[in-house]
């Protein structure tokens, strides 16, 4: 790989995945590439196929076994390499000892659901997906809410700084149609990212009662 | 800033192995990413391996066949480089080197993305 045309990287969902983005200027879209993964102290490796994302990169899993298996722990290294088929011959194109604990990036919050509604209120709980339990309570979430007229880049982000996966949303517009997210961060790890947004939750408000203020 | 100092070079054998240290001081050693580069006789400096601040992501070049391990300790202040199974090739002037940019251990960084160098130690092995 030649200086500063190629990127490699990766993140852990801290169960049983690596998702790794490998890019390179001017490589060829049809080239074939793989990634490896060799743990420094398991039996097992794992390889999976690069495709293409975009015009110069190209993605995969590492899928290291079942979704809520602990495959990794904190003292794990994994060793990932990047191999290209050059005609018979796999030629490595990026290595990179990688610890999965401090790369990480957890799957999407799921279940979302409406506890429950009033005119201006609105309580959304969720739970997490694929989360180890090394983590406890060392999680951290946020929240947007979508209100009309506006986009999800203008929404205000709501921080819950511990393990709370519920949240009453006030002050909200009686007879008003909402849309919801979430996503999730572990506290641990010097690349640990935030996960996708959840898929959004849409609800509706109460309508105000005739004659009364609410 | 950090000053850095080598230790751990010498003559060996093919097939033996050897442990290069890197030890830092007069700075905050946690801030800096650490690399490691050579230079064999009559050649460029060449890059070796590069670690962030934390440790998290390591990137090796691929001329090191997986020989090679850099790790830090960065309550030691310390950075370490692993050569398994030397080859008369390996044989070159071995540098660490400092970085106080941000890396994120995602890119095969240059030389000159490295800002403090130590003086080098020497790696001879012998066939």
């Known amino acids: 790989a030649v200086n500063g045309t190629s990127q490699f990287t990766c993140f852990y969902n801290s169960r049983a995945n690596i998702s790794c983005v490998w890019s390179q200027d001017g490589a060829l879209q049809d080239t074939s590439c793989q990634v490896h993964a060799w743990p420094d102290r398991r039996r097992w490796n794992q390889t999976c196929e690069l495709l293409p994302v975009s015009q110069a990169s190209w993605a995969c899993n590492l899928i290291l076994g079942a979704p809520d298996s602990q495959k990794l722990t904190t003292v794990d290294i994994v060793t990932l390499r990047v191999l290209c088929r050059e005609g018979v011959r796999w030629r490595v194109m990026a290595i990179q000892d990688f610890k999965p604990f401090e790369n990480l990036r957890l799957m999407a919050p799921i279940s979302l659901q409406v506890v429950h509604v009033e005119t201006h209120r609105c309580n959304i709980s969720w739970e997490i997906s694929q989360a180890s339990h090394y983590f406890e309570r060392h999680l951290e979430f946020e929240a947007r809410t979508l209100s009309p007229g506006h986009t999800w880049e203008e929404a205000p982000l709501l921080t819950l700084k511990q393990k709370q996966e519920w949240i009453c949303l006030e002050t909200l517009t009686p007879d008003t149609q909402y849309e919801f997210q979430v996503r999730v961060k572990p506290l641990q790890g010097e690349f640990t990212t935030w996960s996708p947004w959840s898929q959004p939750l849409a609800f509706r408000t109460k309508p105000a009662a005739l004659g009364k203020d609410t | 800033q950090v000053q850095l100092v080598e230790s751990g070079g010498g003559l060996v054998q093919a097939g033996g192995s050897l442990a290069l240290s890197c030890a830092a001081s007069?700075?905050?050693?946690?801030?800096?990413?650490m690399g490691w580069f050579r230079q064999a006789p009559g050649k460029e400096r060449e890059f070796v391996a590069a670690?962030?601040?934390?440790?998290?992501?390591?990137m090796y070049a691929v001329s090191t066949e997986g020989r090679f391990s850099c790790s830090r300790d960065n309550a030691k202040n310390t950075v370490y480089l692993l050569i398994k199974n030397l080859k008369p090739e390996d044989t070159a002037v071995y540098y660490c080197?400092?970085?106080?940019?941000?890396?994120?251990?995602?890119?095969?960084?240059?030389?000159?993305?490295?800002?403090?160098w130590g003086q080098g130690t020497q790696v001879t092995v012998s066939s």
């Open positions: 007069g700075g905050t050693f946690s801030s800096y990413a």
């Open positions: 670690t962030t601040r934390g440790g998290g992501r390591t």
């Open positions: 080197a400092a970085r106080t940019s941000y890396y994120d251990g995602t890119y095969y960084p240059a030389s000159s993305d490295f800002d403090i």
